[in-house]
C-alpha cells in the first residue's frame, strides 16, 4: 500500500502492525485482532477498528486507551465479527450465544435473541446525525465559518466526499452534522459515512486513530472549538425491529 511504503507505518490507522512482507516485498499493515491487511491510504472500516480495540493486548504501545465515557452505542463496546471485506456481519453473537442484528455501523437494530436469530441482510445506515455541544465561548461562532471548517475537516482529514456532508446546523452551543449516503450513492473507493463518523468520534474524545498525528485541533477563525458532549444518531434504510421502538444513539 503506497501510503505505507516509506517507513512501513500506517498513517490512517495506528491499531495496525506493519511489516515488509506484503506482495512484492512491499509494506503490509495488518489490523490488530483480525490480521486483515488494510489500505493505509484511506480509513479502516469501523468493524476492524472495533475488533482491534477489543482484541489487542492491554500493554500494546500503539493502543489508544478507551475513555471511561466511551459512547459507541447503547450497548457499549463489543468484539464484532467482520466479513472478508472488513464490514460488520449482519448477525453478531457474544460468547454466551446471545445474538442480535446490527446495521452497517455495527449498532444493534433488533432485540437480542439466541443462535436461531436470523439477520437476512446487513441493513445500511444511510443517515448519521452527529450532535455536539461545545464549551462556552465569548460569543457564538459564525455559522458559515463553522460550516466551512467542519466540511473541510471531513473532506481533508477523513477523506469523505463533500456531497455526503448534507448539512451543518448550529444553535449555540449545539452543533449538528448530518451525513447522508445511500447505497446507490456510494461508489467504489468512497469513504463510508459510518467510518468517517467513527474516526470523528474518536478524534473528539482525544483518542485519534491516525498514526503519529497530533490530536484534533478544531478552530474556527482561530478560535478553539472544544466539544464537551457528543451524541450520534444512526438512521437505517430499513427501520429497526425492536419490540419497543427507539432511536439508536
Amino acid at each position: 500500500h503506497t501510503a505505507a511504503q516509506d517507513n512501513c507505518t500506517c498513517p490512517t490507522n495506528k491499531m495496525t502492525v506493519c511489516s515488509p512482507d506484503g506482495p512484492g516485498g512491499r509494506c503490509q499493515c495488518r489490523a490488530l485482532g483480525s490480521g486483515m491487511a488494510v489500505d493505509c491510504s484511506t480509513l479502516t472500516s469501523k468493524c476492524l477498528l472495533l475488533k482491534a480495540r477489543m482484541s489487542a493486548p492491554k500493554n500494546a504501545r500503539t493502543l489508544v486507551r478507551p475513555s471511561e465515557h466511551a459512547l459507541v452505542d447503547n450497548d457499549g463496546l463489543y468484539d464484532p465479527d467482520c466479513d472478508p471485506e472488513g464490514r460488520f456481519k449482519a448477525r453478531q453473537c457474544n460468547q454466551t450465544s446471545v445474538c442480535w442484528c446490527v446495521n452497517s455501523v455495527g449498532v444493534r437494530r433488533t432485540d437480542k435473541g439466541d443462535l436461531s436469530l436470523r439477520c437476512d441482510e446487513l441493513v445500511r445506515t444511510h443517515h448519521i446525525l452527529i450532535d455536539l455541544r461545545h464549551r462556552p465561548t465569548a460569543g457564538a461562532f459564525n455559522h458559515s465559518d463553522l460550516d466551512a471548517e467542519l466540511r473541510r475537516l471531513f473532506r481533508e482529514r477523513y477523506r469523505l466526499h463533500p456531497k455526503f456532508v448534507a448539512a451543518v446546523h448550529y444553535e449555540q452551543p449545539t452543533i449538528q452534522i448530518e451525513l447522508r449516503q445511500n447505497t446507490s450513492q456510494k461508489a467504489a473507493g468512497d469513504v463510508d459515512i459510518g467510518d468517517a463518523a467513527y474516526y470523528f468520534e474518536r478524534d473528539i474524545k482525544g483518542e485519534s486513530l491516525f498514526q503519529g498525528r497530533g490530536g484534533l485541533d478544531l478552530r474556527v477563525r482561530g478560535e478553539p472549538l472544544q466539544v464537551e458532549r457528543t451524541l450520534i444518531y444512526y438512521l437505517d434504510e430499513i427501520p429497526p425491529k425492536f419490540s419497543m421502538k427507539r432511536l439508536t444513539a
Epitope: 515488509p20 512482507d21 506482495p23 483480525s34 490480521g35 500494546a60
Partner: antibody
C-alpha cells in the same frame, strides 16, 4: 543471508513443559512477524501462531491457545515457544518461519514419552 | 477460520508431464495464498507467494494462479526431484491455516 536456527531435539516426560528456540540472523528481527508451525509424523502442517518482536504482539490459533506461549528476546534476536502440559499428541516437529514465508528453520523434534 | 481444501490427495505423473495442484478457500481471500514444497524430512520451501509471485531460486517451471477462492500451482514439466508434498497456506486473516496437502509421486 537470512537464517533461522532452531534448538535441538527434545525428549520430555508427559505433563511437563518444553521451551524451544529460533534464533534469527541476516535481517531486522523486529520488522517481521515470526510464525510457528507444527507437523506431526506423517501429517500436514498446522499453524500455531505468530509473534511480532517489534511490539510483542502475539496471535494464536484457538487450538493452541493455552498449549503454546510465544515470546521473543530482541537483544538476542531469538523467538521462543513454550509448550505446556505435554501429551503424546504434542510429539511433532515444530518449525519457525519468517512472515514473508521464504525462510524457515530446520525444525525441532519434540518427543513426549514416559 | 478459513478452510483450505486441496485436491487431489495424491498425484502420480510421469517425468516431463504438466501437473496442477488445486487449493480452494472457504471464503474470498484475494490473492493471499502461498505454495510450499516439502521433501521427506525437510523444511517446507516456498515456491510461490501471493498466488502468482515467483520466488528467487525456484525453477521457472513452477507457476501459480488464481484469486478469490480458487487457486492452482502448476509444474509445466515435472522432474524426478519434484517428488514430495505440496501445501497451500493463506495469509488473509489470522489464523493462517494450511491446506491438507497433495503428495506428488513420479511414475
Amino acid at each position: 543471508q537470512v537464517q533461522l536456527q532452531q534448538s535441538g531435539a527434545e525428549l520430555v516426560r508427559p505433563g511437563t513443559s518444553v521451551k524451544i528456540s529460533c534464533k534469527a540472523s541476516g535481517y531486522t528481527f523486529t520488522n517481521y512477524w515470526l510464525d510457528w508451525i507444527k507437523q506431526r509424523p506423517g501429517q500436514g502442517l498446522e499453524w500455531i501462531g505468530n509473534i511480532f518482536p517489534g511490539g510483542d504482539y502475539t496471535n494464536y490459533n484457538e487450538e493452541f491457545r493455552g498449549k503454546a506461549t510465544l515470546t521473543a528476546d530482541t537483544s538476542s534476536r531469538t523467538a521462543f515457544m513454550q509448550l505446556s502440559s505435554l501429551t503424546s499428541e504434542d510429539s511433532a516437529v515444530y518449525f519457525c518461519a519468517r512472515s514473508s514465508y521464504d525462510y524457515w528453520g530446520q525444525g525441532t523434534l519434540v518427543t513426549v514419552s514416559a | 477460520d478459513i478452510l483450505l481444501t486441496q485436491s487431489p490427495a495424491i498425484l502420480s505423473v510421469s517425468p516431463g508431464e504438466r501437473v496442477s495442484f488445486s487449493c480452494r478457500a472457504s471464503q474470498n481471500i484475494g490473492t493471499s495464498i502461498h505454495w510450499y514444497q516439502q521433501r521427506t524430512n525437510g523444511s517446507p520451501r516456498l515456491l510461490i507467494k501471493y498466488s502468482s509471485e515467483s520466488i528467487s531460486g525456484i525453477p521457472s517451471r513452477f507457476s501459480g494462479s488464481g484469486s478469490g477462492t480458487d487457486f492452482s500451482l502448476t509444474i509445466n514439466s515435472v522432474e524426478s526431484e519434484d517428488i514430495g508434498d505440496y501445501y497451500c497456506q493463506h495469509s488473509y486473516t489470522w489464523p493462517f491455516t494450511f491446506g491438507s496437502g497433495t503428495k506428488l509421486e513420479i511414475k
